[in-house]
């Protein structure tokens, strides 16, 4: 069973590990044969996918989805206007930004059109179902001979997010991790100049604007470290899509940035 969906990175994915379980706060069902549970995720408050396991039906059925917002100005029942399909059978619905109201109770109803009494209704708190995009534009600054500062950006949701930074050296198997609040900045006070470090970050819509449990995907990793010249042991390593901007370009401050930033730096 392959459902084509968009992952939190914004890429297409056809694997089943996207389907994260979130129990509805309320569940009602009519008829003897239960309908599959609907699972909704709001991606960066740009769109929302509500999906169900279409293969759980005893025979292929194009289930229909309706939704509304409880006790609000948006309480008019709406039909799904953009279905997602799995093997030509409906398996989800995508709602666009203008149809998403995070702080109103979202009511979603799945129905079997061939048996209208067979329906299931769930109520969801959308602010707890937000998954941000992965952090972007990771940069490293050298604050002192042994101290590094990691910065990153998030698209749109900055103050609503908490973050988890992980780092390790080349010969570490496990990561050291550190929680970071909405300030999206992390300092590593003691860095061994002989080692190569890898950093990565992920973000979560919690706790200021919601109580989401699910993290974003990990950022692309950024590296700092030892495969550098003997003359300057603190020179940043050149890695994959990352390039070094010279100290002159940055007024004496050394900084590792992504290819995307590099173009931006030279063109503006």
């Amino acid at each position: 069973l392959n459902t084509t969906i968009l992952t939190p990175n914004g890429n297409e994915d056809t694997t089943a590990d996207f389907f994260l379980t979130t129990m509805p706060t309320d569940s009602l069902s009519v008829s003897t044969l239960p309908l599959p549970e609907v699972q909704c995720f709001v991606f960066n408050v740009e769109y929302m996918n509500c999906t169900w396991n279409s293969s759980s039906e005893p025979q292929p059925t194009n289930l229909t989805l309706h939704y509304w917002y409880k006790n609000s100005d948006n309480d008019k029942v709406q039909k799904c206007s953009h279905y997602l399909f799995s093997e030509e059978i409906t398996s989800g619905c995508q709602l666009q930004k203008k149809e998403i109201h995070l702080y109103q109770t979202f009511v979603v109803q799945l129905q079997d059109p061939r048996e209208p009494r067979r329906q299931a209704t769930q109520m969801l708190k959308l602010q707890n179902l937000v998954i941000p995009w992965a952090p972007e534009n990771l940069t490293l600054h050298k604050l002192s001979e042994s101290q590094l500062e990691l910065n990153w950006n998030n698209r749109f949701l900055n103050h609503c997010l908490e973050h988890l930074v992980q780092y390790r050296t080349d010969w570490d198997h496990s990561w050291t991790e550190q929680s970071v609040d909405y300030r999206h900045k992390f300092s590593l006070p003691s860095v061994d100049g002989q080692k190569r470090y890898t950093f990565r970050v992920r973000s979560r819509f919690n706790p200021l604007c919601g109580s989401a449990q699910h993290w974003s995907e990990w950022s692309h990793p950024i590296h700092w470290g030892s495969n550098t010249s003997k003359e300057n042991p603190f020179l940043f390593a050149l890695e994959a899509e990352q390039k070094l901007i010279s100290e002159e370009d940055l007024g004496g401050e050394q900084k590792l940035i992504s290819e995307e930033d590099l173009h931006h730096h030279h063109h503006h």
Epitope: T15, D17, Q166, D172, H173, S174, W175, W218
Partner: antibody
Framework: QVQLVESGGGVVQPGRSLRLSCAAS????????MHWVRQAPGKGLEWVAG????????YYADSVKDRFTISRDNSKNTLFLQMNSLRAEDTAMYYC?????????????WGPGTLVTVSS | DIQLTQSPSFLSASVGDRVTITCWAS??????LAWYQQKPGKAPTLLIY???TLQSGVPSRFSGSGSGTEFTLTISSLQPEDFASYYC?????????FGGGTKVEIK
């Protein structure tokens, strides 16, 4: 669910080569580090080699360094172990294992194994 | 390299017994330790990681403790399905290493 299936084992003479494969499914293979672990008959577990999610770093046990090469093809969801200059002491059941995505990255899924016998 | 020493290597016990297995690391590894169970002819399965965190789906009779250089795996009340071999693994740094194993057999 996660599934790992090793193949390529068999009987081989000392000094010869063998290539093991591990076919992965049920998870986003390109996001996870992978490893080979072996177990000689009646003995304990021995970690052999590991590779980062993108293949950018590879790690080996001293006993196989310069003889074994770990690699992966993320487009085919497959992990490999190229074993050269095989010795009698390489005889073992070879398991591929997937890292769990936690800070400690233990091995949360293992294949059933493929048996390699090095004998003249 | 970090060496792990497991004790005992062999243990005979009865259903209902409380069983403790110890793993020593040759240098401090904080809590970077995992425990695996292996039944004959099968691949290992993860029981505990981060020294004391129970893997999802593992019965609560299994517990882990320790930090630094000494770690223990405890089975509070041995069940028939627990007769197997148990291995510790250090997760701190490469090369990764396993303990020699402890075989738990029926008395």
């Amino acid at each position: 669910q996660v599934q790992l299936v090793e193949s390529g084992g068999g009987v081989v003479q000392p000094g010869r080569s063998l290539r093991l494969s591990c076919a992965a499914s049920g998870f986003n293979f390109r996001n996870f580090g992978m490893h080979w672990v072996r177990q000689a008959p009646g003995k304990g577990l021995e970690w052999v080699a590991g590779i980062l999610y993108d293949g950018s770093s590879k790690y080996y046990a001293d006993s196989v360094k310069d003889r074994f090469t770990i690699s992966r093809d993320n487009s085919k969801n497959t992990l490999f172990l190229q074993m050269n200059s095989l010795r009698a002491e390489d005889t073992a059941m070879y398991y591929c294992a997937k890292e769990e995505d936690t800070a400690m990255v233990p091995f949360d899924s293992w294949g059933p194994g493929t048996l390699v016998t090095v004998s003249s | 390299d970090i060496q792990l020493t497991q004790s005992p290597s062999f243990l005979s016990a009865s259903v209902g017994d409380r069983v403790t297995i110890t793993c020593w690391a040759s240098q401090g590894i904080s809590s970077y330790l995992a425990w695996y169970q292996q039944k004959p002819g099968k691949a290992p399965t993860l029981l505990i990681y981060a020294a004391s965190t129970l893997q999802s789906g593992v019965p609560s009779r299994f517990s882990g403790s320790g930090s630094g250089t000494e770690f223990t795996l405890t089975i509070s009340s041995l069940q028939p399905e627990d007769f197997a071999s148990y291995y510790c693994q250090q997760l701190k740094s490469y090369p990764l290493t396993f303990g020699g194993g402890t075989k738990v057999e029926i008395k």
